[in-house]
């Protein structure tokens, strides 16, 4: 038994025919010793009397409010819930399971930016003597502040015969760090009571895993002169981080009639306008995407093809120009290398992606996977990769990237990827590796060597450890090449001379 | 399953027009969108432009804009490839190909071979 | 109008061994890249759409990856039927224009 606030107690159960329940003794919250009596819920039926009260908890019977009287005076409450368990499972009546990305999701979370700020929200079909109670942190041995605001009743659905009750619930993280790259997951816990039972569900997540931006906004559209063609044009949603030269956006653009089934034109790009070929009847899509970080597309923002306007809407990323960087100059040449560290960089978040895209899809957070993660050097909150910090000094920042990529280099080129079970003769493991390690030659400056982290000695003696450390090692990475590539576009965009 | 099924070989003396035909089946034809690419003897693949058997609108590469004609007859549902003004390094294999994507070429016809020579 | 480049012209293979062919863009075309193979005599066949989408039907033997300017096509394992010429072609705009191609051929 424990207690979940002040008053109420859960009681844990294990739940099989005859089993022998629990033992509780539940003390009288009072000065007085004499004449003190116990009842449950409404009854007046006297359970027992005396300042504690033992009682064997075994059904929901069990459960509900106890109360301590004297001469007719109520002293204290306990409020008795029951945490089912059945087969070593706890019960999870109370939530559907939305089955989506997998089985057993109870909780979704998503993140419109990378603020710190998520929404998360379940379902149950459960509509009366239903309290839900959200608590959050980052990382579990350490907590760092989540806060977290009610749960409310968002969306009310017809399915079938049944009635749907979505929840959702609004957190925020106390010190986000925008730029960062994480290396500790969010934690979400959810208490649900459902009259006298208790569930808690629970989910971890990293807010780069959860975004989804908002859709793109403002489309318009333009004839093109002599063609078929019309240019739609549109900006990056409102919601989405600042400047845009850091945190990027990548869009697909479709043109497709009122059915899936009809032809369609579809054509993916970096930039806030496209060229594409309007039919009648037919609607304009575009929808976002994190140019460098494989989350969730946005839903679609669509517009009519007969709708061309004439007006050009739509933004470029830019930024003002900032000061110089002693980033290595190319080989042959005299400006800094932002450019081709960015193209590089991009190149970078495409094979990591590549390299295991299931690896996104497979929950990898199991025991002792904070010691392995936390050996990879993560680009932390203070090492200046921050839009500020790299216009303050990129120096800090870039050493830390360089610093990164010879690790994940070295990595690469050791036994565990190296070691049984053989990689596939198609992944692109290899290219990987030269990538990493042809940025780190360009960000290297001349006659300057800066000190590199040790390897771990990371030596899984089993062909299923070494790959799940690949698994880890890769997911790992393709975060750690996002921000670089967000530093490497910001950089070209603002750095450049 | 979709199939396109084109036109004989032609020889044709410079300065001449040719018209290859390429008739679909297997799918409603105003479905997917119609593109001609060519391909010159030994040499690379070459787009020519597309048409929406739907409502007859084209787009041609400008190198043959002027010269080129593309057409349907939803009634038999065959898609038409005109060029004009013929010269011997229009000697090509000329494809027609079907997709409900615009941009890339899902299903090939078996190729027409078109022969310019005096 | 955009120009692709394929490189090797020709490379020759061993059957079993890996092949990576090489197609790069004069400018970003980001994911617009779509790789076909055409064996003598007969039409091209789409392999990979959109740089790394496989196609069903199509043996998982073939993969592509890239973005932006450059992208790759590697075919794990040659097996006999391999040995044909592949193309890239880009989709960013039009006109949609093709890489000159690579020969892949028996080591």
């Known amino acids: 038994i424990w207690e979940l606030k002040k008053d109420v107690y859960v009681v844990e159960l294990d739940w099989y025919p005859d089993a022998p329940g629990e033992m509780v003794v539940l003390t009288c919250d009072t000065p007085e010793e004499d004449g003190i009596t116990w009842t449950l819920d409404q009854s007046s039926e006297v359970l027992g009397s005396g300042k504690t009260l033992t009682i064997q908890v075994k059904e929901f019977g069990d459960a509900g409010q106890y109360t301590c009287h004297k001469g007719g005076e109520v002293l204290s409450h306990s409020l008795l819930l029951l945490h089912k368990k059945e087969d070593g499972i706890w019960s999870t009546d109370i939530l559907k399971d939305q089955k989506e990305p997998k089985n057993k999701t109870f909780l979704r979370c998503e993140a419109k930016n990378y603020s710190g700020r998520f929404t998360c929200w379940w379902l149950t079909t459960i509509s009366t003597d239903l309290t839900f109670s959200v608590k959050s942190s980052r990382g579990s041995s350490d907590p760092q502040g989540v806060t977290c605001g009610a749960a409310t009743l968002s969306a009310e659905r017809v399915r079938g015969d049944n009635k749907e009750y979505e929840y959702s619930v609004e957190c925020q993280e106390d010190s986000a760090c925008p730029a960062a790259e994480e290396s500790l997951p969010i934690e979400v816990m959810v208490d649900a009571v459902h009259k006298l039972k208790y569930e808690n569900y629970t989910s971890s997540f990293f807010i780069r895993d959860i975004i989804k931006p908002d859709p793109p906004k403002n489309l318009q559209l333009k004839p093109l002169k002599n063609s078929r063609q019309v240019e739609v044009s549109w900006e990056y949603p409102d919601t989405w981080s600042t400047p845009h030269s850091y945190f990027s956006l990548t869009f697909c653009v479709q043109v497709q009639g009122k059915s899936k089934r009809e032809k369609k034109d579809r054509v993916f790009t970096d930039k806030t306008s496209a060229a594409v070929i309007c039919r009648k009847n037919a609607s304009i899509s575009v929808r976002a995407q994190d140019r460098y970080y494989s989350s969730s597309w946005s839903e679609w923002a669509s517009v009519p093809c007969s709708g061309s306007g004439s007006s050009r809407g739509g933004s470029g990323s830019g930024g003002s120009g900032g000061g110089g960087s002693k980033l290595r100059a190319v080989p042959g040449g005299s400006s800094p290398a932002w450019t081709q560290c960015q193209q590089l960089s991009q190149k970078l978040c495409t094979l990591a992606w590549s390299a295991h895209p299931l690896v996104g899809h497979m929950d990898l957070r199991e025991e002792g996977d904070e010691e392995t993660t936390n050996d990879v050097p993560h680009i932390q909150c203070g090492d200046g990769c921050d839009p500020q910090g790299l216009r303050d000094n990129s120096q800090f920042c870039l050493q830390r990237i360089h610093q990164g990529l010879i690790f994940y280099e070295k990595l690469l080129g050791s036994d565990i990827f190296t070691g049984e079970p053989s990689l596939l003769p198609d992944s692109p493991v290899g290219q990987l590796h030269a990538s990493l390690l042809g940025l780190s030659q360009l960000l290297q400056p001349e006659g300057h060597h800066w000190e590199t982290q040790q390897i771990p000695s990371l030596s899984p003696s089993q062909p299923w450890q070494r790959l799940l450390l690949r698994f880890k090692i890769l997911r790992s990475l393709q975060a750690f090449v996002a921000v670089a590539a967000r530093v490497f576009a910001h950089g070209a965009a603002t750095l450049s001379p | 399953q979709v199939q396109l099924v084109q036109s004989g070989a032609e020889v044709k003396k410079p300065g001449a027009s040719v018209k290859v035909s390429c008739k679909a089946s297997?799918?409603?034809?105003?479905?997917?969108?119609l593109h001609w690419v060519r391909q010159a003897p030994g040499q690379g693949l070459e787009w020519m432009g597309w048409?929406?058997?739907?409502?007859?609108?084209?787009e041609y590469a400008p190198k043959f804009q002027g010269r080129v004609t593309m057409t349907t007859d939803t009634s038999t549902s065959t898609a038409y490839m005109e060029l004009r003004s013929l010269r011997s390094d229009d000697t090509a294999v000329y494809y027609c190909n079907a997709n409900k994507e615009l941009r890339y070429f899902d299903v090939w016809g078996q190729g027409t071979m078109v022969t310019v020579s005096s | 109008e955009i120009v692709m480049t394929q490189s090797p012209a020709t490379l020759s293979v061993s059957p079993g061994e890996r092949a990576t062919l090489s197609c790069r863009a004069s400018?970003?075309?980001?994911?617009?890249l779509h790789w076909y193979q055409q064996k003598p005599g007969q039409a091209p066949r789409l392999l990979i759409y959109f740089a790394s989408q496989s196609i069903s039907g199509i043996p998982a033997r073939f993969s592509g990856s890239g973005s932006g300017t450059e992208f790759t096509l590697t075919i794990s394992s040659l097996q006999s039927e391999d040995f044909a010429v592949y193309y890239c072609q880009q989709s960013n705009s039009f006109p949609l224009t093709f890489g000159g191609g690579t020969k892949v051929e028996i080591k």
């Open positions: 297997g799918y409603t034809f105003t479905d997917y969108y």
């Open positions: 400018q970003s075309i980001s994911i617009n």
């Open positions: 048409i929406d058997p739907e409502n007859g609108d084209t």
